[in-house]
C-alpha cells in the first residue's frame, strides 16, 4: 500500500497518536496564523470568532463511543476538516501579497502545513483501527493537493463573514483536538481493554 506498513505495536502507536494530537491542539499552528493573515487580530473582531455549537463532537460524546466508534468518528471528522482546510487555503492571500502587506510569511507556511499534519494523523488513526481489527474504516484517501477541491461549505458573498466562519471552524477544530487528546490519554496499556 502507498501508506507503507502500519506499526503493529499498540503502545508505540498510541504514544504517537497522543504526541500528534498534543501538537495539533495548539492554536499557534492554525487558528492564530489564520487570524493574523485574515486581519481578524483585533479584540472586537476576535470576540466574534467563537466555536459554532455542534460543528464538532463534544468530549462527552467522544468518551461515550468506545474505541472503535471513537476512531470512526475521528476519521470522519478529520475528513471534513481536510475538505474545509482545502477551501480555506483557496482563499488565502499569496506569499507576495503577504510580503507587500508586511505580514509574516511563516503564518502562511503554518496554514499550508495544516493539511499534511491532519493527513498524517488520519493515517495513524487508520493504523490504530487496523490494530483493533476495525474493518469498517476505509483507508484514508491518498489524494494530495492536486485533487479538485470541494465546494465552499457555506457559500457567501460576504468575504468578512467567510473569514469569521473559517475562524470559528478552526477554533472548534483545536478544541476538538484537545478533546481527542484527552480521550487518547485515557486509553489503557492494552488494545483489548474497554472495547465496545
Amino acid at each position: 500500500a502507498a501508506m507503507g506498513s502500519c506499526s503493529k505495536e499498540y503502545r508505540m502507536l498510541l504514544g504517537q497518536l497522543q504526541k500528534q494530537t498534543d501538537l495539533m491542539q495548539d492554536t499557534s499552528r492554525l487558528l492564530d496564523p489564520y487570524i493574523r493573515i485574515q486581519g481578524l487580530d483585533i479584540p472586537k473582531l476576535r470576540e466574534h470568532c467563537r466555536e459554532s455549537p455542534g460543528a464538532f463532537p463534544s468530549e462527552e460524546t467522544l468518551r461515550g463511543l468506545g474505541r472503535r466508534g471513537f476512531l470512526q468518528t475521528l476519521n470522519a471528522t478529520l475528513g471534513r476538516v481536510l475538505h474545509r482546510l482545502a477551501d480555506l487555503e483557496q482563499h488565502l492571500p499569496k506569499a507576495q501579497d503577504l510580503e507587500r502587506s508586511g505580514l509574516n510569511i511563516e503564518d502562511l507556511e503554518k496554514l499550508q502545513m495544516a493539511r499534511p499534519n491532519v493527513l498524517g494523523l488520519r493515517n495513524n488513526i487508520y493504523c490504530m483501527a487496523q490494530l483493533l481489527d476495525n474493518s469498517d474504516m476505509t483507508e484514508p484517501t491518498k489524494a494530495g493537493r492536486g485533487t479538485p477541491q470541494p465546494p465552499t461549505p457555506t457559500p457567501t458573498s460576504d468575504v468578512f463573514q467567510r473569514k469569521l466562519e473559517g475562524c470559528s471552524f478552526l477554533r472548534g477544530y483545536h478544541r476538538f483536538m484537545h478533546s481527542v487528546g484527552r480521550v487518547f490519554s485515557k486509553w489503557g496499556e492494552s488494545p483489548n481493554r474497554s472495547r465496545r
Partner: antibody, heavy 119, light 113 residues
Framework: EVQLVQSGAEVKKPGESLKISCKGS????????ISWVRQMPGKGLEWMGI????????RYSPSFQGQVTISADKSISTAYLQWSSLKASDTAMYYC????????????WGQGTLVTVSS | DIVMTQSPDSLAVSLGERATINCKSS????????????LAWYQQKPGQPPKLLIY???TRESGVPDRFSGSGSGTDFTLTISSLQAEDVAVYYC?????????FGQGTKVEIK
Amino acid sequence: EVQLVQSGAEVKKPGESLKISCKGSGYSFTSYWISWVRQMPGKGLEWMGIIYPGDSYTRYSPSFQGQVTISADKSISTAYLQWSSLKASDTAMYYCARVPVSPAYLDYWGQGTLVTVSS
Amino acid sequence: DIVMTQSPDSLAVSLGERATINCKSSQSVLYSSNNKNYLAWYQQKPGQPPKLLIYWASTRESGVPDRFSGSGSGTDFTLTISSLQAEDVAVYYCQQYYSTPLTFGQGTKVEIK
C-alpha cells in the same frame, strides 16, 4: 520497530550530482514528516528542510533553499536529498529524521550518510 | 530565525555527579495560550546519530532514564543529568520548534572528569 535506513557513504568530485536516500519502516510512512539535517565535520546540527511524503509538500530552510532538493516516493517509503552540482563545502554527514507534526521535534533518526566532495 | 546558544561548550563531571547544561533562545519559545515551551534536547554519542531525550522542555521521551530532566521557560532552559554515568559521555543539543527554520544550539560536550 521504527527504522530509518539511509544509503551508504558517497565520495564525489565537485560539480557532480548526487541523490541520497532514507527508507522508513516499522511505521506508516505517510503518517509523519521527514526532515533532513546536516552535520559538517566536527560541527553542530543544521536543519535543511522537511517533506510530508503523503503529498510531497516541502519546506526548506532559507540557508538551503535552491542548494538542494528534497523529495519522496511514498510507494517505497523513501525520502531523498539531492544535489545537482556538489561543492567541497557540501562535505558532511547528512541525517534524515522523522517528525510527528510540522514543525516539531525529531523523534527517530537515520544512521546518517557521509558525503565527501573532493577533487 | 531564532538563535539558540548553549553554555558551556564543554564540561567535565565526575561519575555520579550532577551535570548541568544551559540553553538560551534569542526570543521566547513559550506559547502563552497553552503555556508550553517549544524546546527539545538531544544526545549524540560519538559515531552515532542524535537521539531525542526531552520535548516540551521537560517531557522525557519514552525509554529515557529519569536521571535526565529538563526545566526552564521562555528563553532560558536547562538539561540536568542528576548522576552522570559513563554512557552519558556525548554532545547534547537543544532545539526550538516554535518556528521554522528549526534551529539547534551549537552543542555541549560532556566528558568524565
